[in-house]
Amino acid sequence: DSSKWVFEHPETLYAWEGACVWIPCTYRALDGDLESFILFHNPEYNKNTSKFDGTRLYESTKDGKVPSEQKRVQFLGDKNKNCTLSIHPVHLNDSGQLGLRMESKTEKWMERIHLNVSERPFPPHIQLPPEIQESQEVTLTCLLNFSCYGYPIQLQWLLEGVPMRQAAVTSTSLTIKSVFTRSELKFSPQWSHHGKIVTCQLQDADGKFLSNDTVQLNVKHTPKLEIKVTPSDAIVREGDSVTMTCEVSSSNPEYTTVSWLKDGTSLKKQNTFTLNLREVTKDQSGKYCCQVSNDVGPGRSEEVFLQVQYAPEPSTVQILHSPAVEGSQVEFLCMSLANPLPTNYTWYHNGKEMQGRTEEKVHIPKILPWHAGTYSCVAENILGTGQRGPGAELDVQYPPKKVTTVIQNPMPIREGDTVTLSCNYNSSNPSVTRYEWKPHGAWEEPSLGVLKIQNVGWDNTTIACAACNSWCSWASPVALNVQYAPRDVRVRKIKPLSEIHSGNSVSLQCDFSSSHPKEVQFFWEKNGRLLGKESQLNFDSISPEDAGSYSCWVNNSIGQTASKAWTLEVLYAPRRLRVSMSPGDQVMEGKSATLTCESDANPPVSHYTWFDWNNQSLPYHSQKLRLEPVKVQHSGAYWCQGTNSVGKGRSPLSTLTVYYSPETIGRR
């Protein structure tokens, strides 16, 4: 039953003398395992014997024995699915039909495979894409319908006989579908590859040449152009003629249009390979190129820079930067269209030639106000000297100069006066817009740059002003020199350092903090009475009578100032003690009698002691001694002693007489 045998293998296999052939093959016998296999060369069916005749290249029997001469041909299959074969080496006379005679228990089958063996290695085949365009990556494929495990080969790419630098990727296929070796080369052709010969060379494992295939590359590319100019250096003078010629060195496909461009813009009505420029003007200077197009696109030549030479044009001056700040650096640039470039320059400042300045640029490292003005220049080249242009104005800005503060008042200024000051300056650029004053005060500015100080203080020593534009310039401070009466007059005790005791030597000083003018006079006064005209008031031996309220006065030409009243206090021991008796020195018994110890003391008496006629101290210590009821025996002389921090004082005796009352007399 033929439908039970299914085979898969390449239809035809290719090889050459001395190589080998590897035949990938699979089969399926539905009724069981393979029992017998014979490989025929050009088998023919014999109807008489009902068998196949032909050369038997390989035979396997049930016992698995293979004749020794069959080593060249190997059956690499198995009993149920693999029928792969190998012939190594393969010979020219192996060409033809191979017949695989397969037998199972009940079925038989003859499978035919074509084998094409050539005398010499056959060439590979180069496959090119339908179109190759410059700079577009393409893949070149070299295909050889051969591959065999026992015969390694290699495919090498050559360009104009030289191995190509690009890496090729080689792949092999030994499958039931196809047998081949393939090399793929990716590369980006340039226009110069057009017409060049590419070879794919088949080599054996040792690199020995076996065969090759060759193609000439057809690389589509934009026109490749060369531009020629007369004169060759493309340097002419106004009025000369120039000829430019565009040569197409290569174009594929053929070119269709020609045009000329200047500075990237197409020139109208110029559509031939020659561009004639007659009586050129300087405006025709620029970059010229020709453009030729084909179906791939436009090609452009290199640019030719046409220089039309002419004498310098009227110059202009560019200032970096104006306005300039005093002290900064400034650069002047002389700009004049000229070809060739100017070689010499003459510079002018306010119409006067600047000596030693012959360069295109003038650099002033430190600008001063006098540098301001109009700058102009003249450029010169080999063709002539240009005209002086209008020039450029340099504005030099600086802070106000020579700022002074001026006192408008007649001198001297007295405390309390109204003072007017003005802020003056010599020059300023830009103009002064405001003024500042130091120190700050609640002062009036009746007009710009004028300061009015009403009721000027004694301590308004100095005033400074600043005139301001973009910057402020301060004047040196001006002294107001305000005159005033002596200030802070006070009495100061110089000695003694401690409290004043009666008899001490005492010095008082009349002090003041300041006076303008400095020349002063002093006056001492006690209770409206003038005591002296020195700064000091001296007591050789102070007495309690010197105590009192003292003032000193200091005066100068502006006025006089009195100190606060200063109290002079003299400390002394109790004095002028006396005992006074109330109601009198004669008192009736039974009544009350009060003895008072009167004294003069500073500080006041702090402790009293009472004594009787026997100088016996009595147990009483207050200023008053109260006897109640008074007795006759109280009669006698009494005295008291007063004590303070300075010392003690005693009174003279005072006699108290106590007389009997009428009752006592009546009893007697």
Partner: antibody, heavy 116, light 112 residues
Framework: QVQLQQSGAEVKKPGASVKMSCKAS????????LHWVRQAPGQRLEWMGY????????EYNQNFKDRVTITADTSASTAYMELSSLRSEDTAVYYC?????????WGQGTTLTVSS | DIVLTQSPDSLAVSAGERVTMNCKSS????????????LAWYQQKPGQPPKLLIY???TRESGVPDRFSGSGSGTDFTLTISSVQAEDVAIYYC????????FGGGTKLEIK
């Protein structure tokens, strides 16, 4: 060995056309471009154009572009050059040639005489 | 197209003399991929097709006598015959094949 065998001499009248052949042998015809070059008496060699037999792509010298047609028959390994609107100045020897990497092969030439 | 200008147009020398002829190209014929100059020199005798003498500007074709040598690169090339023989009487053409093909006007060599 490589050979380029050209057809025999031609005599044509002005305004007519001529078609001459170049049979290649000894190499794979489709592998190389085939060029046509002419030489008028006492004049320099002048390239006319080529054909790539692999894909019939042609490229011509602009001077001949409107009058020349180059074709190829790969089965016969033969290239043809047809020149139309003949003028007396087309009187020349016409060569087919091809380049290999390191050499050039030339046909023996076909003489064309254009005369009234 | 690339224009080739040959000089001189003709020259007459005695047998055994050294002779040089020049070929100037309007553009470089150096091919950057293999650093070869795509310029050939031919000898053409009356009634014969051109015979290749030199390719790649300086490589002598096999079978060409070694008295013929080529030199130059880029745009300027020279063919030298070190010792002229009577059989060298011919027209010599230079040929660029970098881009399309163009030929020089030829230099005619005669023997005095």
């Amino acid at each position: 060995q490589v050979q380029l065998q050209q057809s025999g001499a031609e005599v044509k009248k002005p305004g007519a056309s001529v078609k001459m052949s170049c049979k290649a042998s000894g190499y794979t015809f489709t592998s190389y471009w085939l060029h046509w070059v002419r030489q008028a008496p006492g004049q320099r060699l002048e390239w006319m154009g080529y054909i790539n037999p692999r894909n019939d792509y042609t490229e011509y010298n602009q001077n001949f572009k409107d009058r020349v047609t180059i074709t190829a028959d790969t089965s016969a390994s033969t290239a043809y050059m047809e020149l139309s609107s003949l003028r007396s100045e087309d009187t020349a020897v016409y060569y087919c040639a091809r380049r290999d990497i390191t050499t050039f092969y030339w046909g023996q030439g076909t003489t064309l005489t254009v005369s009234s | 197209d690339i224009v080739l200008t040959q000089s001189p147009d003709s020259l007459a020398v005695s047998a055994g003399e050294r002779v040089t002829m020049n070929c100037k190209s309007s553009q470089s014929v150096l091919y950057s991929a293999n650093h070869k100059n795509y310029l050939a020199w031919y000898q053409q005798k009356p009634g014969q097709p051109p015979k290749l003498l030199i390719y790649w500007a300086s490589t002598r074709e096999s079978g060409v006598p070694d008295r013929f040598s080529g030199s130059g690169s880029g745009t300027d090339f020279t063919l030298t015959i070190s010792s002229v023989q009577a059989e060298d009487v011919a027209i010599y053409y230079c040929h660029q094949y970098l881009s399309s093909w163009t030929f020089g006007g030829g230099t005619k060599l005669e023997i005095k």
